[in-house]
C-alpha cells in the first residue's frame, strides 16, 4: 500500500481467483484513544472499532472511503483505490490501446518545436467518475523539471456503437535547451483513477523524436505566363522554432487529381517555393518535416489548382 | 578550414557534408519508431558517447558569441563515431551488406572532422570506450543504438553548419 | 452494555415499542440492530440504525417495524402485531465490529 | 436484499474432527460478513467479523475465509463446547440477513 496524495492510498493487488488479496491497517488521524468507530462509503453499519483497522482487501467492494468517527463526529478519511495486477502485468482498462507507432501504446506525445512545450494526450470510452493526474521530467534518476497542467477532455468521438473521450495535457520543461542534443528522455507518467481503480501510464521519449510541425501557413500559387507551371510559394508555420536558418524545415510538394487514384506529383525541397504543373481540378499540397531529423512530416496545407 | 587557433570553418562545405551525413544515417537505420532501444538497456552503451550539450555554446548566440567551443565538441563527436564504425562492431558478424550506407557513412564523419581539423592540429579527442559485444545480436542491437545516437548528433551539427554558412560566412 | 425491555404478552393488532437501553458508549458511534428468533427457529435481522441516524429494513420488515433512535436508546415499534411475530427480539451493537455486543432479548408473544 | 444461503442445516463431527460451514451470498458483499455460535437460550456470540477477522475472545480454532461470494467458517480441532447452532450475518452496510443456520453435533 501506498499514499497517492493525502489520504488517498493505493492497495497493489494481484488479481486472480482465490487470491489471499492484502492485509490493510488504516489508523486513525486523531489524539484521541477510544470510542473510535469506522463505516466504508455510505454504510450505515460499523466496520469496526478502535484507533486501527486492519481489513482483508481482495476485491472492490473492500475499496472506497473509510471514515473514522467519535460521538457522531467524523474525525479522519482513507479512500482506498485498487490496482490490480494479473499475470504480473498491471491492468491497463482505464485507457484505449491506440496500437501506434506500437501495440501497447497508451499515451501519445507531440511537440510542435523545439522549445521544451509537448502535449500528450489519450483515448478511453469511460465518461464519468475519472481523474486523471499528470507528472512529467527529464530523466528519471536525476529527474530535472517538467511541469504539466491539467488534463482536460478535448475530443469526444463516436466509434461504432461506443463514445470515445480524448484527454490531453500540455507540459513545459522547464529549464529547455532547443540547440542541445538531448541524452536524457522526458517520462511522462499519467495516473488514471475511474470510481476505485487505479492505474498508472507511462512515456518516455525525446522531443526530437515526437517532432510535429503545424502544416506551412500562406500557401499561395502564381501562375506563369504562357505556361501551365505555377509557381508554389508558403512560409514556416509561426509556431516553429527560430530562427530557421538554424532550425530548418524540408517540404514536400504535391499535385493530386481529384480523384484518389490518379497518380501524385511529388517534389522535395528545401526552400519556401517550387515551381509544378497544375492540373485542371487537381489540388497542390505542402507538408513539413525538420530537416535534419525525420521526425513526423506535419499535416497538409492544400490549396486548389483553379 | 577550422583552425584551434579560432579561425572559421569553411561552413558552406562543412553545411554540405553534414547534411549529407543525415541523410546517411537515416538510410543506414530508417527504422525510427518501430524499435525502442531505450527498452533494452542503455546504460553501458550510449553513456560515453559525447552529447552536444546546453553548455557547449552550439546555439545560435553561443555561435555568435564564440564558435570555437561547440565545433571543437562537433569534432570530438565525429572522431568517436568515426571511431565506433570502424570498430569491430561494425567490422565484426554479422557482416552489413555490401551496399550498406555504413561505409560511407564512415567516409563521411571522417571526411568532416578532417574539414574542421586539418593535418597538424590536435584538439583534444574523446577515449572510446571498449565496446565488443559478444554475441552477434548484441551487436546488431549495438549498431542500431550507435545510429539512433549519431542521427541526433550529426541533426545538431548540421543546424550549426546551415546557420553558420548562412549568418557567419565571411 | 446493551439490554432490551418492553417485550410482553399483546393481542394482534396492538402496537409495541421494544427499547434498547445501552450504557458505557454513545449511540452516535455505533450502529444498533435489531434480531429477532421465533420459537426453535433461525435468527431472523429486522433492521439498523446507523451512525447519521438513518434506519434500514429487511425488504419482509418495511412497514412492519420502525426503527427510532434518543440518546441511550433505541425503539423498534411493531406496528400491528400477528402471531408470526412470536419471537424474543435482540439488540445488538456494530454486528460487524469486533466489539460487536448483543442483548439478552425481550420476549414477545402475539396471541388473541 | 442479499440472501445468505447456509450450509449444511446440520452436522456432526468428532472431538478432535473439523467441522465446514458455508454462505453463499446472492451478490458481492467483500468484507460485510459475520459468523456467530448460538447455545440453547442464550443470546448470539459473535465469531468471526469482517469475514475472516476473530472477534475477540475467541479461540484460534475457529478460521472464517472467503472466496469470492463464499464464505466458510472452519472448526478445526472441534471441542465438546463447539456443539451449538451456527449463523451467517451478510449484507451491503446497510441490509443485512442471515443464513439459516447450521447445527453442529459433537460426538
Known amino acids: 500500500i501506498w499514499e497517492l496524495k493525502k489520504d488517498v492510498y493505493v492497495v497493489e493487488l494481484d488479481w486472480y481467483p482465490d487470491a489471499p488479496g492484502e492485509m490493510v491497517v488504516l489508523t486513525c488521524d486523531t489524539p484521541e484513544e477510544d470510542g473510535i468507530t469506522w463505516t466504508l462509503d455510505q454504510s450505515s453499519e460499523v466496520l469496526g472499532s478502535g484507533k486501527t483497522l486492519t481489513i482483508q482487501v481482495k476485491e472492490f467492494g473492500d475499496a472506497g472511503q473509510y471514515t473514522c468517527h467519535k460521538g457522531g463526529e467524523v474525525l479522519s478519511h482513507s479512500l482506498l483505490l485498487l490496482h490490480k495486477k494479473e499475470d504480473g502485468i498491471w491492468s491497463t482498462d482505464i485507457l484505449k490501446d491506440q496500437k501506434e507507432p506500437k501495440n501497447k501504446t497508451f499515451l501519445r506525445c507531440e511537440a510542435k518545436n523545439y522549445s521544451g512545450r509537448f502535449t500528450c494526450w489519450w483515448l478511453t470510452t469511460i465518461s464519468t467518475d475519472l481523474t486523471f493526474s499528470v507528472k512529467s521530467s527529464r530523466g528519471s534518476s536525476d529527474p530535472q523539471g517538467v511541469t504539466c497542467g491539467a488534463a482536460t477532455l478535448s475530443a469526444e468521438r463516436v466509434r461504432g456503437d461506443n463514445k470515445e473521450y480524448e484527454y490531453s495535457v500540455e507540459c513545459q520543461e522547464d529549464s529547455a535547451c532547443p540547440a542541445a542534443e538531448e541524452s536524457l528522455p522526458i517520462e511522462v507518467m499519467v495516473d488514471a483513477v475511474h470510481k476505485l481503480k487505479y492505474e498508472n501510464y507511462t512515456s518516455s521519449f525525446f522531443i526530437r523524436d515526437i517532432i510535429k510541425p503545424d502544416p506551412p501557413k500562406n500557401l499561395q500559387l502564381k501562375p506563369l505566363k504562357n505556361s501551365r507551371q505555377v509557381e508554389v510559394s508558403w512560409e514556416y508555420p509561426d509556431t516553429w522554432s527560430t530562427p530557421h536558418s538554424y532550425f530548418s524545415l524540408t517540404f514536400c510538394v504535391q499535385v493530386q487529381g481529384k480523384s484518389k487514384r490518379e497518380k501524385k506529383d511529388r517534389v522535395f525541397t528545401d526552400k519556401t517555393s517550387a515551381t509544378v504543373i497544375c492540373r485542371k481540378n487537381a489540388s497542390i499540397s505542402v507538408r513539413a518535416q525538420d530537416r535534419y531529423y525525420s521526425s513526423s512530416w506535419s499535416e497538409w496545407a492544400s490549396v486548389p489548382c483553379s | 578550414r577550422a583552425v584551434p587557433g579560432g579561425s572559421s570553418p569553411a561552413w558552406t562545405q562543412c553545411q554540405q557534408l553534414s547534411q549529407k551525413l543525415c541523410t546517411l544515417a537515416w538510410s543506414a537505420h530508417p527504422l525510427v519508431g518501430h524499435m525502442d532501444l531505450r527498452e533494452e538497456g542503455d546504460e553501458e552503451t550510449t553513456n560515453d558517447v559525447p552529447h552536444i550539450q546546453c553548455g557547449d555554446g552550439c546555439d545560435p548566440q553561443g555561435l555568435r558569441d564564440n564558435s570555437q567551443f561547440c565545433l571543437q565538441r562537433i569534432h570530438q563527436g565525429l572522431i568517436f563515431y568515426e571511431k565506433l564504425l570502424g570498430s569491430d562492431i561494425f567490422t565484426g558478424e554479422p557482416s552489413l551488406l555490401p551496399d550498406s550506407p555504413v561505409g560511407q557513412l564512415h567516409a563521411s564523419l571522417l571526411g568532416l572532422s578532417q574539414l574542421l581539423q586539418p593535418e597538424g592540429h590536435h584538439w583534444e579527442t574523446q577515449q572510446i570506450p571498449s565496446l565488443s559485444p559478444s554475441q552477434p545480436w548484441q551487436r546488431l542491437l549495438l549498431r542500431f543504438k550507435i545510429l539512433r545516437s549519431l542521427q541526433a548528433f550529426v541533426a545538431v551539427a548540421a543546424r550549426v553548419f546551415a546557420h553558420g554558412a548562412a549568418t557567419l560566412s565571411p | 452494555s446493551v439490554e432490551e425491555s418492553g417485550g410482553r404478552l399483546v393481542t394482534p393488532g396492538t402496537p409495541l415499542t421494544l427499547t434498547c437501553t445501552v450504557s458505557g458508549f454513545s449511540l452516535n458511534s455505533y450502529s444498533m440492530s435489531w434480531v429477532r428468533q421465533a420459537p426453535g427457529k433461525g435468527l431472523e435481522w429486522i433492521g439498523v440504525i446507523g451512525l447519521g441516524g438513518s434506519a434500514y429494513y429487511a425488504s419482509w420488515a418495511k412497514g412492519r417495524f420502525t426503527i427510532s433512535g434518543a440518546s441511550t436508546t433505541v425503539d423498534l415499534k411493531i406496528t400491528s402485531p400477528t402471531t408470526e411475530d412470536t419471537a424474543t427480539y435482540f439488540c445488538?451493537?456494530?454486528?460487524?465490529?469486533?466489539?460487536?455486543?448483543w442483548g439478552p432479548g425481550t420476549l414477545v408473544t402475539v396471541s388473541s | 436484499d442479499v440472501v445468505m444461503t447456509q450450509t449444511p442445516s446440520s452436522t456432526s463431527a468428532a472431538v478432535g474432527g473439523t467441522v465446514t460451514i458455508k454462505c453463499q451470498a446472492s451478490?458481492?458483499?467483500?468484507?460485510?460478513l459475520s459468523w456467530y455460535q448460538q447455545k440453547p437460550g442464550q443470546r448470539p456470540k459473535p465469531l468471526i467479523v469482517r469475514a475472516s477477522t476473530l472477534a475477540s475472545g475467541v479461540p484460534s480454532r475457529f478460521k472464517g475465509n472467503r472466496s469470492g461470494t463464499e464464505y466458510t467458517l472452519t472448526i478445526s480441532g472441534v471441542q465438546r463446547e463447539d456443539a451449538a447452532a451456527y449463523y451467517c450475518l451478510g449484507g451491503d452496510g446497510n441490509v443485512s440477513n442471515f443464513g439459516g443456520g447450521t447445527k453442529v453435533v459433537v460426538v
Open positions: 451478490q458481492s458483499i467483500s468484507s460485510w
Open positions: 445488538a451493537r456494530a454486528t460487524y465490529s469486533d466489539d460487536n455486543i
